[in-house]
Interface confidence: low
């Protein structure tokens, strides 16, 4: 059998790895870079030609409990005169993140990783026009 | 940690907060998400603040591939298809949680890591600083 390529290091288990029951994995939820902060331009959600609002969703059985979602304010985009131009479209930009879900089954508790799709903001795009014959 | 409502009939030994270390199922919930933004939409090309997507791969992380957006222009694309420097293309950044293998190379032992990614770009009116 060939030696696995460098990209396959995932499958070479060092002796120091902690024992883990089959079908599960050990997860330390003490976050690395916990205090990192977003350094986006100021108030871009209001200054954008495709402005958006933020909503905070809160779930006590999720870690982290708070997830912030953006919603585009308009269908169209804001032009130089400050008016909505419906010949252009405001569209959401989305990104996946991971959360830990805590599940209660009777008195027992289990944990599950979950992919969450977060809308992070909006951008202004030229619409795709479908011509009907 | 965060407080968890508990079944009042359960014994009191359960911690109300998330423990520091948990055992989680290997399967990740939610199949409706698409990890490759190039396949999920062409907004990066159609935007008035278009961006390029750069592949960031790290086998010690899950997901191992993350796409980073870089705005193509300082300005925005106007109706004529030219760059208008009276407006600015700026990145939209987001903190996301990923899994970092800890200890390194271990198949089933991870730690949550917060990373900052640029997801796309948006066109904004610039902040003009008037000098007295």
């Amino acid at each position: 059998r060939k030696i696995p390529k460098v990209g396959h290091t995932f499958f070479q288990k060092p002796e120091s790895c902690p024992p883990v029951p089959g079908g599960s994995m050990k997860l330390d939820i003490g976050i690395i870079n916990e205090n990192q902060r977003v350094s986006m331009s100021r108030n871009i959600e209001s200054r954008s030609t495709s402005p958006w609002n933020y909503t905070v969703t809160w779930d006590p059985n999720r870690y982290p409990s708070e997830v912030v979602q953006a919603q585009c304010r308009n269908l169209g985009c804001i032009n130089a005169q400050g008016k909505e131009d419906i010949s252009m479209n405001s569209v959401p930009i989305q990104q996946e993140t991971l959360v830990v879900r805590r599940k209660h089954q009777g008195c027992s508790v289990s944990f599950q990783l979950e992919k969450v799709l977060v809308t992070v903001g909006c951008t202004c795009v030229t619409p795709v026009i479908h011509h009907v014959q | 940690g965060i407080t968890i409502p508990r079944n009042p009939g359960c014994p009191n030994s359960e911690d109300k907060n998330f423990p520091r270390t948990v055992m989680v199922n290997l399967n990740i919930h939610n199949r409706n998400t698409n990890t490759n933004p190039k396949r999920s939409s062409d907004y990066y090309n159609r935007s008035t603040s278009p961006w390029n997507l750069h592949r960031n791969e790290d086998p010690e992380r899950y997901p191992s591939v993350i796409w980073e957006a870089k705005c193509r222009h300082l300005g925005c694309i106007n109706a004529d298809g030219n760059v208008d420097y009276h407006m600015n293309s700026v990145p939209i950044q987001q903190e996301i949680l990923v899994l970092r293998r800890e200890p390194p190379h271990c198949p089933n032992s991870f730690r949550l890591e917060k990373i900052l990614v640029s997801v796309g770009c948006t066109c904004v009116t610039p902040i003009v600083h008037h000098v007295a």
Epitope: H8, F10 | R31
Partner: nanobody
Framework: EVQLVESGGGLVQAGGSLRLSCAAS??????MGWLRQAPGKEREFVAA????????YYADSVKGRFTISKDNAGITMYLQMNSLKPEDTAVYYC?????????????????WGQGTQVTVSS
């Protein structure tokens, strides 16, 4: 788009063997895998093989009992299942995926066959 067709499922007694096949047509892929879903349970990873055939990966629950392989042309993948147990009863799916990291993540498989039923009686 990859088309996948599984075969070889059936009813077998505990301790018996079955060989599943998965015929693939279409574009290339980084890995192919077998996944299964028992009634009322989550779909779970069983085994995977890299596109080159050099590397194979197994779930702990089947290690030593199941063997994944593919033909030289890379068109057909097999799952040889020995020492079958009642808990192996499930619909078995073959699927393709991009990338070889975290092959156990069932979400990252892109193309799925229609599934073949495996029933192990005690």
């Amino acid at each position: 788009e990859v088309q996948l067709v599984e075969s070889g499922g059936g009813l077998v007694q505990a301790g018996g063997s079955l060989r599943l096949s998965c015929a693939a047509s279409g574009r290339t892929y980084d890995a192919m895998g077998w996944l299964r879903q028992a009634p009322g349970k989550e779909r779970e990873f069983v085994a995977a093989i890299s596109g080159s055939g050099d590397d194979t990966y197994y779930a702990d629950s089947v290690k030593g009992r199941f063997t994944i392989s593919k033909d030289n042309a890379g068109i057909t993948m097999y799952l040889q299942m020995n020492s079958l147990k009642p808990e192996d009863t499930a619909v078995y799916y073959c699927a393709t995926r991009r990338g070889l990291y975290y092959v156990w993540d069932t979400n990252d498989y892109e193309n799925w066959g229609q599934g073949t039923q495996v029933t192990v009686s005690s």
